[in-house]
Amino acid sequence: TQNKALPENVKYGIVLDAGSSHTSLYIYKWPAEKENDTGVVHQVEECRVKGPGISKFVQKVNEIGIYLTDCMERAREVIPRSQHQETPVYLGATAGMRLLRMESEELADRVLDVVERSLSNYPFDFQGARIITGQEEGAYGWITINYLLGKFSQKTRWFSIVPYETNNQETFGALDLGGASTQVTFVPQNQTIESPDNALQFRLYGKDYNVYTHSFLCYGKDQALWQKLAKDIQVASNEILRDPCFHPGYKKVVNVSDLYKTPCTKRFEMTLPFQQFEIQGIGNYQQCHQSILELFNTSYCPYSQCAFNGIFLPPLQGDFGAFSAFYFVMKFLNLTSEKVSQEKVTEMMKKFCAQPWEEIKTSYAGVKEKYLSEYCFSGTYILSLLLQGYHFTADSWEHIHFIGKIQGSDAGWTLGYMLNLTNMIPAEQPLSTPLSHSTYV
């Protein structure tokens, strides 16, 4: 591919998503002469970096270079050598690094420093690593899915090709679930966004959008599980925690020091008379659901309505794309079909959680036990978050579309991030000539 007689007039961009549980590298490609057109950028590669999220390297920063090598070398292979020097590389770190920064700004800076040292040694145009805000994460996820769905285009292009096309220009809301945070972003219907922190104004392709967004730090699936364990161990009579969110017969020893390592469990921290405790699964969806609901404070709301923890949430409006862990978990549970009602999802979760651990291990022999053991919790958490947290109902459930990819590109914040940083989302409808940089978002 590197020796074409007539090179295509294309450009490439690389974004690394440094999430709390892992890092993924995405390579995007677009025709150089169509930079300002909507929907021309597409993903050509995803490379999942082997290992944990970058925040876990805080005591072993010397290993970061090796950690990133395979995927960066993959990028070197995929992108023609002649394009290397003009290919921008961006790294955005999300809630895992936000949490590390809350604990120690210096430790977070040390990790980012070494990440930048590592990435700048490649032949690309490295544009820096940074911790993106929760608001940015929500906004860029919203931009990504609507860009890929053709919602910013004046023509209803891709009608009948895009599976979620509703034959109108009404944007989709974005629901993103990570390991350490979750984001909800959508355009409310003629509703004032009562809290300024949750309001975004965009002008994209000649149209104004008033967007609501919020990122709930500590409410990603992994941190939510730590929160639940910290809450439940408070009332355990001994070092055994009988947990309804794990399959019957499942056992796991947890170090109390690991439990209290994250800022997300600080509110539940107490001196315990043991250093370790054992989770013993009892596999009961209803009890698991009840336990999860205790993580959402719904007793206080200073606005006309709230999601939870006193955070403003306007009435839900339109269709939503639910991606990242919303999709991965529901896909594993075989619950992503548009035809599966919320009641059916709940029924299937009840059955799944009640299945004995030995049976589950046999049925899913190829899946790592660490991940396999947590699907009951994660599935229940997704239902709790969407129904009680965000106030979806059995009726509005059908407006949630669990999306992995759209037109071959992963749904997530990375594409929107790159489109913005490369000035590829014009404020006005592009004419024949590109607009000056000052007019971009």
């Epitope: 210096e106 040390r110 420093d113 930048e116 040292r117 040694n121």
Partner: antibody, heavy 121, light 107 residues
Framework: QVQLVQSGAEVKKPGSSVKVSCKAS????????ISWVRQAPGQGLEWMGS????????NYAQKFQGRVTITADESTSTAYMELSSLRSEDTAVYYC??????????????WGRGTLVTVSS | EIVMTQSPATLSVSPGERATLSCRAS??????LAWYQQKPGQAPRLLIY???TRATGIPARFSGSGSGTEFTLTISSLQSEDFAVYYC?????????FGGGTKVEIK
């Protein structure tokens, strides 16, 4: 109080190599990075590269890539800069400088006195 | 790489007067900019970092401002010891880069 003490002046022949040292006296590198900056006679400052001892791998300006090697010995709190294939244009004062901190704190809060390297046949 | 451009190359100022030095970056460096002073035969000395924060021991007559691509170093009332060459340096992205310098000389 930490000082950066550099090795003495050198006169080198074109085509040869030079290795300049920079020792943190009165302290250690204490997890700080060391950059090398050069200044040709009557010219401005030119960043050559940097090493963070706890990371080990150096970063270089593209202009010097392949010709410069920056290393650090944590046990002696000494950084080294080796420049090969010397030419007359490499005649300059070579400074080591400590980076103030990590990430966005890569400015230089402590400088060595400089080492004059003269390349002449 | 980010190109740093300083202007003017030379600034002639009388003692007691105000000196304003400019530094422009070829792309945004946010507020990640440092200023150094260098006197003949000496190593540079850090004056300002983060665009506007004075380094330890730097007199209050030195002030920095700006963000993004345009930066200014102001010396409010020049003292005899301030006549020197001043360099800006971006500390946002690799490779780290310096401006070409501004020589402040006695008028």
């Amino acid at each position: 109080q930490v000082q950066l003490v550099q090795s003495g002046a050198e006169v080198k022949k074109p085509g040869s190599s030079v290795k300049v040292s920079c020792k943190a006296s009165g302290g250690t590198f204490s997890d700080k990075a060391i950059s090398w900056v050069r200044q040709a006679p009557g010219q401005g400052l030119e960043w050559m590269g940097s090493i963070l001892p706890i990371f080990g791998t150096a970063n270089y300006a593209q202009k010097f890539q392949g010709r410069v090697t920056i290393t650090a010995d944590e046990s002696t709190s000494t950084a080294y800069m080796e420049l090969s294939s010397l030419r007359s244009e490499d005649t300059a004062v070579y400074y080591c400088a400590r980076e103030a901190g990590y990430y966005r704190y890569r400015y230089f809060d402590l400088w060595g006195r400089g080492t004059l390297v003269t390349v002449s046949s | 790489e980010i190109v740093m451009t300083q202007s003017p190359a030379t600034l002639s100022v009388s003692p007691g007067e105000r000196a304003t030095l400019s530094c422009r970056a070829s792309q945004s460096v946010s507020s990640n900019l440092a200023w150094y002073q260098q006197k003949p035969g000496q190593a540079p000395r850090l004056l300002i970092y983060g665009a506007s924060t004075r380094a330890t021991g730097i007199p209050a007559r030195f002030s920095g401002s700006g963000s993004g691509t345009e930066f200014t170093l102001t010396i409010s009332s020049l003292q005899s010891e301030d006549f020197a060459v001043y360099y800006c340096q971006q500390h946002a992205l690799w490779p780290l880069t310096f401006g070409g310098g501004t020589k402040v000389e006695i008028k």
